[in-house]
């Protein structure tokens, strides 16, 4: 006769492991008992359980409540056992020793491999600001057994670097994603992808990129200079910029206070019916937590009685 078993049994942490051991005997042979032992190198054999043909299943106190026979129907030549709720410490070598009548004893070994699926974590790097050089956008860490694979899925251009730390029964892998921040990256997803044989599918953690920036400011509203004449209603200046975080706007007049009746509404400066006192240099000040920008324009209100043309100067400053 001969023993049939597996070289390696692989199970995910917390699952039940079936340790197979089947005696393929000749006609008339009987299995008297099947002894299971843990036989890791450098340590003596530690009995796990024993199946006795007459007195049933015996379990070592160290494995009390964790070793069972597979459910019926059972073949009397089958010495397989179930190890319930596999833990990482169960990983190792096991020996099945079968005592038969009248052929004697047979033994076989298998390796139990316990997969520990990773629980990945993603940590964003420091605040991203346009104008920075190569900067850490995020790091992703996953620990498991065996070592997990950590990669990145993104449309954003960047570089990755990985490092691994081996522990006694597992390995931690950390991958970093570096990029040169630009405003076009705002709102883009950066996804950490963790692969592992103990996972049914890859685990994904997504981080949305936020890049602080502030665009140059400009003022719109003076395109047609002939419209800026005494008595005109609804005249307005609009300050144009964009940023992250969204900027705030402030209007001032360089050559004095804002004239009475002029309304400030965020990025817009609204004028009452124009008079010559509305002529002057107006400054739009745009700012967010990252930076600030200024843009100034000169308004000349035309007197229709005069035949002179309106002059407009447009200056942008940072």
């Amino acid at each position: 006769g001969e023993l049939e078993t597996s070289d390696v049994v692989t199970v995910v942490l917390g699952q039940d492991a079936k340790l197979p051991c089947f005696y393929r005997g000749d006609s008339g042979e009987q299995v008297g008992q099947v002894a299971w032992a843990r036989v890791d190198a450098g340590e003596g054999a530690q009995e796990l359980a024993l199946l006795h043909s007459k007195y049933g299943l015996h379990v070592s106190p160290a494995y009390e409540g964790r070793v069972e026979q597979p459910p019926p129907p059972r073949n009397p030549l089958d010495g397989s056992v179930l190890l319930r709720n596999a833990v990482q410490a169960d990983e190792g070598e096991y020996e099945c020793r079968v005592s038969t009548f009248p052929a004697g004893s047979f033994q076989a070994r298998l390796r139990l491999r316990v997969l520990v699926p990773p629980l990945p974590s993603l940590n964003p790097g420091p605040a991203l600001e346009e104008g920075q050089g190569l900067t850490l956008a995020a790091s992703c860490t996953a620990e498991g057994s065996p070592a997990p694979s950590v990669t990145w899925d993104t449309e954003v251009k960047g570089t990755t670097s990985s490092r691994s730390f081996k522990h006694s029964r597992s390995a931690a892998v950390t991958s970093e994603f570096h990029l040169v921040p630009s405003r076009s990256m705002n709102g883009q997803p950066l996804t950490c992808v963790v692969s592992h044989p103990g996972l049914l599918q890859d685990q994904r953690i997504t981080h949305i990129l936020h890049v602080s920036f502030l665009a140059e400011a400009s003022v719109r509203g003076l395109e047609d200079q002939n419209l800026w004449h005494i008595g005109r209603e609804g005249a307005m200046l609009k300050c144009l910029s964009e940023g992250q975080p969204p900027p705030s706007y402030n209007w001032t007049r360089l050559d004095g206070p804002l004239p009475s009746g002029v309304r400030v509404d965020g990025d817009t400066l609204g004028f009452p019916p124009l008079t010559t006192e509305h002529s002057g240099i107006y400054v739009c000040h745009v700012s967010n937590e990252f930076s600030s920008r200024d843009s100034q324009v000169t308004v000349d209100v035309l007197d229709p009685q005069e035949d002179s043309g309106k002059q407009v100067d447009l200056v942008s400053a940072s």
Partner: nanobody
Framework: EVQLVESGGGLVQPGGSLRLSCAAS????????MGWHRQAPGKQRELVAT???????NYADSVKGRFTISRDNGKNTLYLQMNSLRAEDTAAYYC?????????????WGQGTQVTVSS
């Protein structure tokens, strides 16, 4: 042949404890199984507990958590620590040594030791 001699029985009050011993001699194999059975007056013999050479155990439901079986392979001695004894544990306790024999197993029995639980 295998010879078994039990000791340690006696009279004990309910809730008390006793420790039985069984000394084995003769041709004991390396794959033997040892255990304790008991037989109360007018009842069939029942299995109490068995233990393998490697220390794996099997207990009857009625004694789980109260009785502990152990063995000293070097001395070929079997023990049964009995705690929280009840009146229904009153019986003759027999040591058994299970040895391979031909096409199966052969049970060798001791003469027994009496345990009486009474107030």
């Amino acid at each position: 042949e295998v010879q078994l001699v039990e000791s340690g029985g006696g009279l004990v009050q309910p809730g008390g404890s006793l420790r039985l011993s069984c000394a084995a001699s003769g041709s004991i194999s390396s794959i033997n199984l040892m255990g304790w059975h008991r037989q109360a007056p007018g009842k069939q013999r029942e299995l109490v507990a068995t233990i393998t050479r490697g220390g794996s155990t099997n207990y009857a439901d009625s004694v789980k958590g109260r009785f502990t079986i152990s063995r000293d392979n070097g001395k070929n001695t079997l023990y049964l620590q009995m705690n929280s004894l009840r009146a229904e544990d009153t019986a003759a306790y027999y040591c058994v040594d299970v040895e391979p024999s031909g096409m199966g197993w052969r049970d060798y029995w001791g003469q027994g030791t009496q345990v009486t639980v009474s107030s």
